[in-house]
Amino acid sequence: ISYDSPDYTDESCTFKISLRNFRSILSWELKNHSIVPTHYTLLYTIMSKPEDLKVVKNCANTTRSFCDLTDEWRSTHEAYVTVLEGFSGNTTLFSCSHNFWLAIDMSFEPPEFEIVGFTNHINVMVKFPSIVEEELQFDLSLVIEEQSEGIVKKHKPEIKGNMSGNFTYIIDKLIPNTNYCVSVYLEHSDEQAVIKSPLKCTLLPPGQESESAESAK
């Protein structure tokens, strides 16, 4: 197999592919463009199957600077040759290209979550979509970090089956009347840097006398 189409990667665009709420989202930024495009069209082909570039339907003549490719890009192994065209009215301002391998280029954004503090534990409710495509699971692990008074504890809940639907994890054996902060993120089985969620904090309510006496035993 030879993939020797012209190597015309244009440095005028910066692309990023992210797994956001288990959707494949391609976003882009422009460098040094004096005229800002009014709209964009995104096209792609698969390197190993040299066919004509295909327009992504929901990203044709779009004013957004991102595109949801979940239903288009199904393989984590193949190279997707991506071309972004920028327009001002009917005039093509630029065209830039980039090659993506999802297994290498995908970054994993943290899931949405909520926390509720109780006297000596915190309920962490992580929100996953109801259905997640198998190829978008990426052998990911959920990590919940608990921070208090400079001490960080990592929790790696075991999730049975796919990461789909809402998931509740209880961080227990906590100290009443203490401030705790929680962050969640998705970890891949490689050396890649993780993207942690912003911290959510809660001050646990004070315990009853009997409870604190009990915990002192």
Epitope: Y3, S5, H77, N99, W101, I104, D139, D190
Partner: antibody
Framework: QVQLQQSGGELVRPGTSVKVSCKAS????????IEWIRQRPGQGLEWIGV????????KSSKNLKGKATLTADKSSNTAYMQLSSLTSDDSAVYFC????????????WGQGTTLTVSS | DVVMTQTPLTLSVTIGQPASISCKSS???????????LNWLLQRPGQSPKRLIY???KLDSGVPDRFTGSGSGTDFTLKISRVEAEDLGVYYC?????????FGGGTKLEIK
Amino acid sequence: QVQLQQSGGELVRPGTSVKVSCKASGYAFTNYLIEWIRQRPGQGLEWIGVINPGSGNSKSSKNLKGKATLTADKSSNTAYMQLSSLTSDDSAVYFCARSGVYGSSPDYWGQGTTLTVSS
Amino acid sequence: DVVMTQTPLTLSVTIGQPASISCKSSQSLLDSDGKTYLNWLLQRPGQSPKRLIYLVSKLDSGVPDRFTGSGSGTDFTLKISRVEAEDLGVYYCWQGTHFPQTFGGGTKLEIK
């Protein structure tokens, strides 16, 4: 024709670092991944990691515990692997190779770079 | 990590005779995209490895058709219908379905 030309062999001291280069020619550099594989003396093959030269994004095996840093320079069509905190265990032949489809194993390989770590 | 187990360790074959190498993986290599990323390499003495077969059974260009790859799931086989002198070396299976990619321990093919 496709060629991956690796830098020459190295004899280095334990605790130091080394940077191995892999210069690609005969094809469009950003259209393929560059993978790195090592072979300890008399042993089998061990996968180190992979880089997309176009994006600079890479993945490395956790088994190497952060020892390898992969980079690529599009302007010179060259991929690099920096190995740090070297020990005698890191003495091996290091290969770079190119892949079009991740996981389908490389179709072209460099000639190998012999690294010897010894005091 | 996925463990790849190759047998036999050494194979001693007369030229013109067939040869067979087995490779078993500790988990299925069928990917969610429907493909199986199981490859076979040959490393001749003093040389870099060379890919022979990818995706279980696809022959690389220039590889003679006396080589065939087969299998699915966790069990795979490389067969050489008639061994020739140039076939000697170490054969490796390599899986690329799961991260990190892993290799079998190798099978040394010797000529009797």
